[in-house]
């Protein structure tokens, strides 16, 4: 039975040209995390493999940085970066846990971080 939950940074906003950290945290399970995939819609942004380290997709190499931790830093944001982002935790023996973050990239300087929330 999958008992874990993923806590994410939830709905967040950031300014155009700035950067943002996408963070997920898996809790309430003793399952071993073997890999975390970061995806935007159906595009793979990055992989963090527990044994080997990070792989950043070539098309995002200039604007995506690993970390902190299992998180992902998006840089030089554009309004086209607005949308859903998913952290996909591959675990053993539980299986796969997925967290969702919605990022809105704003033109103005009124961007603020949203509240944290949980996805079972």
């Amino acid at each position: 039975m999958m008992t874990g939950t993923i806590e994410t940074t939830g709905n967040i906003s950031a300014e155009k040209g700035g950067s943002i950290i996408l963070q997920c945290h898996l809790s309430s399970t003793t399952a071993q995390v073997t890999q975390v995939n970061w995806e935007q819609q159906d595009q793979l942004l990055a992989i963090c493999n527990a044994d080997l380290g990070w792989h950043i997709s070539p098309s995002f190499k200039d604007r995506v940085a690993p970390g902190p931790g299992l998180g992902l830093t998006l840089q030089s944001l554009t309004v086209n970066d607005t949308g859903e982002y998913f952290c996909i935790y591959h675990t053993y023996p539980d299986g796969t846990y997925t967290g969702r973050i919605f990022l809105e990239v704003l033109e103005s300087s009124v961007a603020e971080h949203g509240a944290r929330f949980q996805i079972p």
């Epitope: 073997t34 890999q35 493999n49 527990a50 080997l52 380290g53 690993p66 591959h90 053993y92």
Partner: antibody, heavy 117, light 107 residues
Framework: EVQLLESGGGLVQPGGSLRLSCAAS????????VSWVRQAPGKGLEWVGY????????YYADSVKGRFTISRDNSKNTLYLQMNSLRAEDTAVYYC??????????WGQGTLVTVSS | DIQMTQSPSSLSASVGDRVTITCGAS??????LNWYQQKPGKAPKLLIY???SLHTGVPSRISGSGSGTDFTLTISSLQPEHFATYYC?????????FGQGTKVEIK
């Protein structure tokens, strides 16, 4: 005691194929990722590829991508490296190594692969 | 790929000497740096992982330090069993990459 034992090396002609095996014992094989690392004669270490413990996903060095395939049989505690389209530059001692926390914490004794006509 | 550069490529030292080997990464690898010892005809052995953590059974006279791009392996008092080749390896960005090795020889 953790043990890894490679086999299957030998002399093969350029363009030929070879399958290496790595028999594991002394630990729960299905809980660990495993890599192949090679060392050309008199040279340094080069990572070849990796296979995840449970889901079986793999990563490869660019130098072997499309030619080498890693697989594992958790029921037999065995790792495999299928090498096709072999080249002279693939000549090396091939080690299997258990992956742990980013390092390779236990290694086999190695098996020599010689690609020559 | 991240390039790992070790220095020196070889060194001569005597039993009891303090020996330092450095390893530099072409970009930050945080603390994801491992050190191995290899003797002729033998497989490498893990000495240190995550820059400074000793692997099981490794004597405390061997230590590692550093973070970011610059790392050091130190043997505080060289013993006969320490004459070997040492490799650093990063595990921050796939593919894992090794330094070219540092051979420690008897003076």
């Amino acid at each position: 005691e953790v043990q890894l034992l490679e086999s299957g090396g030998g002399l093969v002609q350029p363009g030929g194929s070879l399958r290496l095996s790595c028999a594991a014992s002394g630990f729960t094989f299905s809980n660990y990722g495993v890599s192949w690392v090679r060392q050309a004669p008199g040279k340094g270490l080069e990572w070849v590829g990796y296979i995840n413990p449970s889901r079986g996903y793999t990563y490869y060095a660019d130098s072997v991508k499309g030619r080498f395939t890693i697989s594992r049989d958790n029921s037999k505690n065995t790792l495999y490296l299928q090498m096709n389209s072999l080249r002279a530059e693939d000549t090396a001692v091939y080690y299997c190594a258990r992956s742990y926390g980013g390092g390779f914490d236990y290694w086999g004794q190695g098996t020599l692969v010689t690609v020559s006509s | 790929d991240i390039q790992m550069t070790q220095s020196p490529s070889s060194l001569s030292a005597s039993v009891g000497d303090r020996v330092t080997i450095t390893c530099g990464a072409s970009q930050t690898i945080e603390r994801r740096l491992n050190w191995y010892q290899q003797k002729p005809g033998k497989a490498p052995k893990l000495l240190i992982y995550d820059a400074s953590s000793l692997h099981t059974g490794v004597p405390s006279r061997i230590s590692g330090s550093g973070s970011g791009t610059d790392f050091t392996l130190t043997i505080s008092s060289l013993q006969p069993e320490h004459f070997a080749t040492y490799y650093c390896q990063q595990s921050y960005i796939i593919p894992p990459t090794f330094g070219q090795g540092t051979k420690v020889e008897i003076k």
